[in-house]
Amino acid sequence: APARLICDSRVLERYILEAKEAENVTMGCAEGCSLGENITVPDTKVNFHHWKKSEAGRHAVEVWQGLALLSEAMLRSQALLANSSQLPETLQVHVDKAVSGLRSLTSLLRALGVQKEAVSPPEAASSAAPLRTVAADTLCKLFRIYSNFLRGKLKLYTGEACRRGDR
């Protein structure tokens, strides 16, 4: 992926739009489309001042780990959907899109250097508090977390990283 493609705001906005679309679709289905189990996902809440005041290395860890956890969660839901006959096929399309989107975002962030920043210097990773997580038991909640993660931590991190790259 071109190193700074993620710095074009339209790129991230496209993924955010896809995530919101999926969230809206799943809001309409019975019980938010139950997954039948609890899937661990990153907590997407942001104390804005705390985020802005903590170091970039810590942000990188949070975003990189969060993205990995979300990717695992989406793959797990994909597997659960494949084994379910109750859920409409259109949902499968949204999950597939999200899986593909998370792969692309991971590549885009790797190109931006988030992976390097997340592991070096080592003290950044060790001093970072363990990633806060929550449980998602419906597709609706999973897509909401996905959408919030992109709109919140991911967008904040890429904004900072892209600004640093401009200097």
Partner: antibody
Framework: EVQLVQSGAEVKKPGESLKISCKGS????????IGWVRQMPGKGLEWMGW????????RYSPSFQGQVTISADKSISTAYLQWSSLKASDTAMYYC??????????WGQGTLVTVSS | SYVLTQPPSVSVAPGKTARITCSGD??????AYWYQQKPGQAPVLVIY???KRPSGIPERFSGSNSGNTATLTISRVEAGDEADYYC??????????FGGGTKLTVLG
């Protein structure tokens, strides 16, 4: 002890300009942001904006963007809120507050601004 | 822009539990903050990050936040708790939004 001391009450005429101040002491001024909050007579709190004195980053509430200017002088640990042309509807109590991970954890005593012809 | 809605007033007898609610679209996805303001005074932060208490705030004050609603709970209410209470939240963009405020009246 953390203290935010605001400038005194002001009585102004419509169309006049004004700059009120908020001086921080008892803490590292550049390690925290300063937020400004409006409270019109008998009404609730309205967030106007915040400034990071260290990076000079400012964010305005959409409702106040273009209506006021927020600034800071870190050399004297002071934040400012100013108007270029006051309106009668700007009559209110204006509070500054320190913004930390515990947002708006310390407040100034407030500056009452009265705009009347 | 994001809107937080609070009931204009809540009444409670001394010694009882007061619950003040704050609702906003998917508020549970954001941190909630609560402030107490007594007449003629500046506001005071009583709860931050949904449920944490700043030092000096009594344990009687607690907070929760899920779905579309954040709740400030004041147990064993005292006459001195009578005040206006405001909820607030950070948006992902860095805006800080206050609710309209709730007047807590302690009866008797």
């Amino acid at each position: 002890e953390v203290q935010l001391v605001q400038s005194g009450a002001e009585v102004k005429k419509p169309g006049e300009s004004l700059k009120i101040s908020c001086k921080g002491s008892g803490y590292s001024f550049t390690s925290y942001w300063i937020g400004w909050v409006r409270q019109m007579p008998g009404k609730g709190l309205e967030w106007m904006g915040w400034i990071d004195p260290y990076r000079s980053e400012i964010r305005y509430s959409p409702s106040f963007q273009g209506q006021v200017t927020i600034s800071a002088d870190k050399s004297i640990s002071t934040a400012y809120l100013q108007w270029s042309s006051l309106k009668a509807s700007d009559t209110a109590m204006y509070y500054c507050a320190r913004v930390s991970s515990e947002p708006f954890d310390s407040w100034g005593q407030g500056t009452l601004v009265t705009v009347s012809s | 822009s994001y809107v937080l809605t609070q009931p204009p007033s809540v009444s409670v007898a001394p010694g009882k539990t007061a619950r003040i609610t704050c609702s906003g679209d998917k508020l549970g996805d954001h941190y909630a903050y609560w402030y107490q303001q007594k007449p003629g005074q500046a506001p005071v932060l009583v709860i931050y990050d949904d449920s944490k208490r700043p030092s000096g705030i009594p344990e009687r004050f607690s907070g929760s936040n899920s779905g579309n609603t954040a709740t400030l709970t004041i147990s064993r209410v005292e006459a001195g708790d009578e005040a206006d209470y405001y909820c607030a939240t950070w948006t992902f963009e860095g805006d800080y939004v206050f609710g309209g405020g709730t007047k807590l009246t302690v009866l008797g």
